[in-house]
């Protein structure tokens, strides 16, 4: 089995995790994709997934998680906004391809969220305009319950993560099911 590696990202409460998962667009452009958390001794749990079939660049939001699948680019973007300490954990992107096992990432994201808002700009945001306009209408796609406990050996999509700047404005107007609660229960 292929050894899964992980990258550690240390963020402050309130910041945004921004992950870009590359995939072969000819193979997986319209496939359903998901963002999962992996807890010790448990099977991966799906927190959010794209629609089936996945819609091009159409944002899907579940709580504070936003997925955007860019078919033209072979890129799934995952954002977790207004991070909380309890969001800390191990995450991964997967591509569902039934009846085969999910197509998983080598690089998992080890997210560590600490208390206190950083006054130092994050490494990936330098815009003069950086307003995250979270859609007021939340699209919640039905996610398959099945996730394989086994590691796949085929070449997976690739992923990396960004940390947004502390001065990024998160506009939560008219959003009813965002924050105040952990991403998962």
């Amino acid at each position: 089995a292929t050894k899964l590696t992980e990258e550690k990202y240390e963020l402050k409460e309130g910041q945004t995790l921004d992950v870009k998962c590359d995939y072969t667009l000819e193979k997986f452009a319209s496939s359903q994709k998901a963002w999962q958390i992996i807890r010790d001794g448990e099977m991966p749990k799906t927190l959010a997934c794209t629609e089936r079939p996945s819609k091009n660049s159409h944002p899907v939001q579940v709580g504070r998680i936003i997925l955007e699948d860019y078919h033209d680019h072979g890129l799934l973007r995952v954002r977790m906004v207004n991070l909380q300490v309890e969001d800390s954990g191990l995450y991964q992107c997967v591509i569902y391809q039934p009846p085969k096992e999910p197509h998983m990432l080598f690089d998992r994201i080890r997210l560590v969220v600490t208390k206190g808002f950083s006054g130092t700009p994050g490494s990936n945001e330098n815009s003069t305009q950086n307003v995250y306009k979270i859609p007021p209408t939340t699209t919640k796609a039905l996610c398959p319950l099945y996730t394989s406990p086994r590691t796949v050996t085929q070449a997976p999509p690739k992923s990396t993560a960004d940390v947004s700047t502390p001065d990024s404005e998160i506009n939560l107007t008219n959003v009813t099911d965002i924050i105040r609660v952990p991403v998962f229960n």
Epitope: P157, S159, T160
Partner: antibody
Framework: EVQLVESGGGLVQPGGSLRLSCAAS????????MSWVRQAPGKGLDWVAS????????YYVESVKGRFTISRDNAKNSLHLQMNSLRAEDTAVYYC?????????WGQGTLVTVSS | EIVMTQSPATLSVSPGERATLSCRAS??????LAWYQQKPGQAPRLLIY???IRATGIPARFSGSGSGTEFTLTISSLQSEDFAVYYC?????????FGGGTKVEIK
């Protein structure tokens, strides 16, 4: 077929302004991030700015912040770069590119020369 | 800012031979790395993304590998049309940054 056609380049004096435009066709413009990348004569590639589909996220390289403004008109399938307070070091071929992180399609570029 | 360093600056190779180009990042970019080819007087063309995924229409002789800070672009058997300048680019963090380029010339 994806087509990106830049216009608006030319000779301008230091401190002057130019507005570059890019006409896009052959793909769903309103579903794509767009960017500008430049290349000084005989030099390498430099990213300038990126803009999300709905302009809710915009990013610039530090050297142009406060001087350049990227914008888009999804109704007209067009991308723009307003360049003010131009400097000699802004002299380059400016490419309109499809994508916000990596760049799948490129225009042929428009040359901007800043010189007195 | 993540600094991308390419080596060598110039690579002299005979047609039919293998070419190996290197790209190093000043900090980890995981697999968010792309390779471009640029011929004189032309715009760049995307070859590889996700460090190892070939872009649409790119011949199989082009392959990418690496993760983290060390990356390689390999052209298994150079064709005449492959002589050009090659750039790597990271897209993990803004500002997006390119390497200085490697010129692949005919030996």
């Amino acid at each position: 077929e994806v087509q990106l056609v830049e216009s608006g380049g030319g000779l301008v004096q230091p401190g002057g302004s130019l507005r570059l435009s890019c006409a896009a066709s052959g793909f769903t413009f309103s579903s794509n991030w767009m960017s500008w990348v430049r290349q000084a004569p005989g030099k390498g590639l430099d990213w300038v700015a990126s803009i999300k589909q709905d302009a809710s996220e915009i990013y610039y390289v530090e050297s142009v912040k406060g001087r350049f403004t990227i914008s888009r008109d999804n109704a007209k399938n067009s991308l723009h770069l307003q360049m003010n307070s131009l400097r000699a070091e802004d002299t380059a071929v400016y490419y309109c590119v499809r994508g916000g992180w990596r760049f799948e399609s490129w225009g042929q570029g428009t040359l901007v020369t800043v010189s007195s | 800012e993540i600094v991308m360093t390419q080596s060598p600056a110039t690579l002299s190779v005979s047609p039919g031979e293998r070419a190996t180009l290197s790209c190093r990042a000043s900090q980890s970019v995981s697999s968010n790395l792309a390779w471009y080819q640029q011929k004189p007087g032309q715009a760049p063309r995307l070859l590889i993304y996700g460090a190892s995924i070939r872009a649409t229409g790119i011949p199989a002789r082009f392959s990418g590998s690496g993760s983290g800070t060390e990356f390689t672009l390999t052209i298994s058997s150079l064709q005449s049309e492959d002589f050009a300048v090659y750039y790597c680019q990271q897209y993990k963090n803004f500002p997006l940054t390119f390497g200085g380029g490697t010129k692949v010339e005919i030996k």
